[in-house]
Interface confidence: medium
C-alpha cells in the first residue's frame, strides 16, 4: 500500500459544495476507488471490464460521482464545518496486474466563504 499527499489540487469548491478529485493512472483498466473521511468510507466506485467492449460501473456506497479516463470526482454538497477533515482517495488497482492499493489524501479546510447559502 502506497500512502501520500495528493500532488494535485484535490478539492474544488463551487456553489456551496466541493468536488473531491481522485486521480488514477490512465493505464488502469479496472479499479475500485473509495473516498474516505478519516477512516470512514463515504463513497465508492468500481469500474470493471465486461464482455466485448462493455464496462460495468458499480457503487456500493453511492455518492454523486463523475468518471473520466484518469480520475473519479466525488461531490459533497451543503458544506458545513463538520465536513472539515482529512479525506483520502483509496485506489485498488485490479488491472493491469499485480493488484495494488494506493492511498492519497489531504485536509479539507472549510471557510465561511465556501459554505452553502452564505449571503454575499
Amino acid at each position: 500500500e502506497i500512502n501520500g499527499s495528493a500532488n494535485y489540487e484535490m478539492f474544488i469548491f463551487h456553489n456551496g459544495g466541493v468536488q473531491i478529485l481522485c486521480k488514477y493512472p490512465d493505464i488502469v483498466q479496472q479499479f475500485k476507488m473509495q473516498l474516505l473521511k478519516g477512516g470512514q468510507i463515504l463513497c465508492d466506485l468500481t469500474k470493471t471490464k465486461g464482455s466485448g467492449n462493455t464496462v460495468s460501473i458499480k457503487s456500493l456506497k453511492f455518492c454523486h460521482s463523475q468518471l473520466s479516463n484518469n480520475s473519479v470526482s466525488f461531490f459533497l454538497y451543503n458544506l458545513d464545518h463538520s465536513h472539515a477533515n482529512y479525506y483520502f482517495c483509496n485506489l485498488s488497482i485490479f488491472d493491469p496486474p499485480p493488484f495494488k492499493v494506493t492511498l492519497t489524501g489531504g485536509y479539507l479546510h472549510i471557510y465561511e466563504s465556501q459554505l452553502c447559502c452564505q449571503l454575499k
Partner: antibody, heavy 124, light 108 residues
Framework: EVQLVESGGGVVRPGGSLRLSCVAS????????MSWVRQAPGKGLEWVSG????????DYSDSVKGRFTISRDNAKNSLYLQMNSLRAEDTALYYC?????????????????WGQGILVTVSS | EIVLTQSPGTLSLSPGERATLSCRAS???????LAWYQQKRGQAPRLLIY???SRATGIPDRFSGDGSGTDFTLSISRLEPEDFAVYYC?????????FGPGTKVDIK
C-alpha cells in the same frame, strides 16, 4: 450451485425472428455481466453479444450487429437475445455464459458458467 | 479483429503422456487476456485457464497455461482418460472476443 437455463430456440425460416431467454439461479445475477456465445453444428465457438450488469452497456459481433439485441431483466434473473432477420448461417447452439471476476479482485474473465445451450435452426 | 490460430488441429496421445497445445494470435493480446476452455462432446465448454496462466476454480494442477503477447500454450502434464476433448483458446482483450478453431486431443 449456479445454473443457467436457456429456452426459446426452435426452427425458423430465413428472415424470421426468435427470442432466446436464459434464467439464472444460485447467483446474485446483477453482480455479473453476461454474454451469448454460439456454436454452429460441428464447428467452433463464436462470441455473439455481451451486456454489463445493469443493461446500460452492450456489444455485438459484426456478424449480428443491427439484427440481434441483447437485454436483461435483473428482477427476473433473466438474459434475452432478440434475433431478427435470421439467416441460415445463424443456425447454431446458443449458450448464455456468465462473466467471472477472479480470485479476490475484479480481474475480468469470461466465462466461468455456461448454460446447456439451445438450438436455433434457420431453414426454409 | 484478433484471429487465433491453434496447432496442432488434432493431437493423438496415450493416457499418462504430456500434451502441449499452442495458440497464436494475429496481434498482441495485451494484459494476457487469454483463456483456455475444454469441451467434451454434447457438453458446454468449461473454463480451465484465464489470464494466460491462472487456473480456474476446481481445475487440477496438471493443467497449466503459459505465454504472453502473441504466443500461448496449454500443457497437460499427464493425460487422464477424462482429458480427451477439444480445447479452445479465447482472447477477451479486444472486441469482438474471438476463439481459436480448437485442438482435438484424442486417444492414440
Amino acid at each position: 450451485e449456479v445454473q443457467l437455463v436457456e429456452s426459446g430456440g426452435g426452427v425458423v425460416r430465413p428472415g424470421g425472428s426468435l427470442r432466446l431467454s436464459c434464467v439464472a439461479s444460485g447467483v446474485t445475477f446483477d453482480d455479473y455481466g453476461m454474454s451469448w456465445v454460439r456454436q454452429a453444428p460441428g464447428k467452433g465457438l463464436e462470441w455473439v453479444s455481451g451486456i454489463n450488469w445493469n443493461g446500460g452497456d452492450t456489444d455485438y459481433s459484426d456478424s449480428v450487429k443491427g439484427r440481434f439485441t441483447i437485454s436483461r431483466d435483473n428482477a427476473k434473473n433473466s438474459l434475452y437475445l432478440q434475433m431478427n432477420s435470421l439467416r441460415a448461417e445463424d443456425t447454431a447452439l446458443y449458450y448464455c455464459a456468465r462473466d467471472f471476476y477472479g480470485s479476490g479482485s475484479y480481474y475480468h474473465v469470461p466465462f466461468d458458467y455456461w448454460g446447456q445451450g439451445i438450438l436455433v435452426t434457420v431453414s426454409s | 479483429e484478433i484471429v487465433l490460430t491453434q496447432s496442432p488441429g488434432t493431437l493423438s496421445l496415450s493416457p499418462g503422456e504430456r500434451a502441449t497445445l499452442s495458440c497464436r494470435a494475429s496481434q498482441s493480446v495485451s494484459r494476457s487476456y487469454l483463456a483456455w476452455y475444454q469441451q467434451k462432446r454434447g457438453q458446454a465448454p468449461r473454463l480451465l485457464i484465464y489470464g494466460a496462466s491462472s487456473r480456474a476454480t476446481g481445475i487440477p494442477d496438471r493443467f497449466s497455461g503459459d505465454g504472453s503477447g502473441t504466443d500461448f500454450t496449454l500443457s497437460i502434464s499427464r493425460l487422464e482418460p477424462e482429458d480427451f476433448a477439444v480445447y479452445y483458446c479465447h482472447q477477451y482483450d479486444m472486441s469482438p472476443f474471438t476463439f481459436g478453431p480448437g485442438t482435438k486431443v484424442d486417444i492414440k
